[in-house]
């Protein structure tokens, strides 16, 4: 299946936290393909974060297409990690919280966080940059939200929502005051360029969020951060499309770009390392 990206205008009422995907194809736009059949299929909508129905033309398209709602949910919703509605007060941790920290077979000296089941706390470790396991988080907060117990012994999920101990209702943890423009692309687009720890001089690009442009820098060959792209196009694709203009009532409208379909690399990347 080809990997194609089609821009849509998206309006949503609530602001959601950064999206974590089980599979990168879950972020592909629904693609009906060039054929004219009318086939009911399901796709994962990264904006509503739900599996939804769409009409598939019967040929081509992409991997974000499933025969059933159940198959879509199984592949694209992180049920084990993101149970927003839980049936019990003592919410269970995802299985991967109990995996030992695993630096992986590469050696890139990247700071990550894992849940230590012995100490019952999230701790820092050095991740190598490839493979490993899912007990691997970019931030301490994210690790705590998913794997640590909350103050009252219940789980806080990573949508910034926690189960109210009194009436089992969902309570948002925070609401942001909207500004005219906000950045809703990958969080690493806002980080400064980081040469890393090695001695190479590789030509790379990083997104400069102050001027809103991709700029070249010299990468050392290891370490650094994720604001690091091999081409200017790759950088723009991942970061430039993240600016979203706010409209009334705090809704979001994503600026529509009219262009022909073209092969692009997906801009939404997994924060978790894929499972073994």
């Amino acid at each position: 299946d080809s990997e194609e990206d089609e821009e849509h205008t998206i309006i949503t009422d609530t602001e959601l936290p950064p999206l974590k995907l089980m599979h990168s194809f879950c972020a592909f736009k629904a693609d009906d393909g060039p054929c004219k059949a009318i086939m009911k299929r399901f796709f994962f909508n990264i904006f509503t974060r739900q599996c939804e129905e769409f009409i598939y033309g019967g040929c081509e398209g992409n991997q974000n297409r499933f025969e059933s709602l159940e198959e879509c949910k199984k592949m694209c919703t992180r049920d084990n990690a993101n149970r927003i509605i839980k049936t019990t007060l003592q919410q269970e941790k995802p299985d991967f919280c109990f995996l030992e920290e695993d630096p992986g077979i590469c050696r890139g000296y990247i700071t990550r966080y894992f849940y230590n089941n012995q100490t019952k706390q999230c701790e820092r470790f050095k991740y190598g940059g490839c493979l490993g396991n899912m007990n691997n988080f970019e931030t301490l907060e994210e690790c705590k939200n998913i794997c640590e117990d909350g103050p009252n012994g219940f789980q806080v999920d990573n949508y910034g929502t926690q189960l109210n101990a009194v009436n089992n209702s969902l309570t948002p943890q925070s609401t942001k005051v909207p500004s005219l423009f906000e950045f809703h692309g990958p969080s690493w687009c806002l980080t400064p360029a980081d040469r890393g720890l090695c001695r190479a001089n590789e030509n790379r690009f990083y997104y400069n969020s102050v001027i809103g442009k991709c700029r070249p820098f010299k990468y050392s060959g290891c370490g650094g951060n994720e604001n690091n792209f091999t081409s200017k196009q790759e950088c723009l694709r991942a970061c430039k499309k993240g600016f979203i203009q706010r409209i009334s009532k705090g809704g979001l409208i994503k600026t529509k770009r009219k262009r022909k379909k073209q092969r692009v690399k997906i801009a939404y990347e997994e924060i978790f390392v894929k499972n073994m």
Partner: antibody, heavy 123, light 112 residues
Framework: QVQLQQSGPGLVKPSQTLSLTCAIS??????????WSWIRQSPGRGLEWLGI?????????SYAVSVKSRITINPDTSKNQFSLQLNSVTPEDTAVYYC?????????????WGQGTLVTVSS | DIVMTQSPLSLPVTPGEPASISCRSS???????????LNWYLQKPGQSPQLLIY???NRASGVPDRFSGSGSGTDFTLKISRVEAEDVGVYYC?????????FGQGTKVEIK
């Protein structure tokens, strides 16, 4: 110059255990800038990764799901080698088995390979 | 598992001419830290595989500059600018984006 020297029997009976050893020279099995793997090659399956071990703060391993219930890869630090054990073999396990070093520092890849051992599973 | 699909499976070449091998992954090889999690290997007749290209586009030590790797997402290419007789063998792509590590089925390059 890293060299990997494989040894072990070329013929194994069905239901028995396949055992191969890979002796390392020019590097250490405990090196924190390498990982050590077994890969097999057969006409039907092509190159198939079986598993890997590596030492960082402690020993880690990962195995292919297809063989996970039957495979063990162990380091032997005293002899600077690592071994493959594959239990309950069937004719499907007939292949050329390679040990390989994964370079963990700059060159992320299998940069050194053993000479290969053809293992035939037959009674 | 990520499935790696190579094309063509057989590539007859003329010495001095360019050659190109394609490798497609069943899902995007996630691009983190500026790295493409894809390698290329060459297995010459009767030998073990050898690393040619690592991290998508970097030549391994001792590999001639006529070899180059490119691509991102799901589509990758190995190019030989001018094929030499010693380049014959089977070329494999390999991903290390997620376990299990998987290889393409191989492209056999032979002299016409």
């Amino acid at each position: 110059q890293v060299q990997l020297q494989q040894s072990g029997p070329g013929l194994v009976k069905p239901s028995q255990t396949l055992s191969l050893t890979c002796a390392i020279s020019g590097d250490s099995v405990s090196s924190n800038s390498a990982a050590w793997s077994w890969i097999r090659q057969s006409p039907g399956r092509g190159l198939e990764w079986l598993g890997i071990i590596y030492k960082r703060s402690k020993w880690y391993n990962s195995y292919a799901v297809s063989v996970k219930s039957r495979i063990t890869i162990n380091p032997d630090t005293s002899k600077n080698q690592f071994s493959l054990q594959l239990n309950s073999v069937t004719p499907e396990d007939t292949a050329v088995y390679y040990c390989a070093r994964w370079h963990s520092d700059k060159m992320w890849g299998f940069d050194d390979w053993g000479q290969g051992t053809l293992v035939t599973v037959s009674s | 598992d990520i499935v790696m699909t190579q094309s063509p499976l057989s590539l007859p070449v003329t010495p001095g001419e360019p050659a190109s091998i394609s490798c497609r992954s069943s899902q995007s090889l996630v691009f983190r830290f500026g790295i493409t999690y894809l390698n290329w290997y060459l297995q010459k007749p009767g030998q073990s595989p050898q690393l040619l290209i690592y991290k998508g586009s970097n030549r391994a030590s001792g590999v001639p500059d006529r070899f180059s790797g490119s691509g991102s997402g799901t589509d990758f290419t190995l190019k030989i600018s001018r094929v030499e007789a010693e380049d014959v063998g089977v070329y494999y792509c390999q991903q290390y984006d997620s376990y299990p590590l998987t290889f393409g089925q191989g492209t056999k390059v032979e002299i016409k």
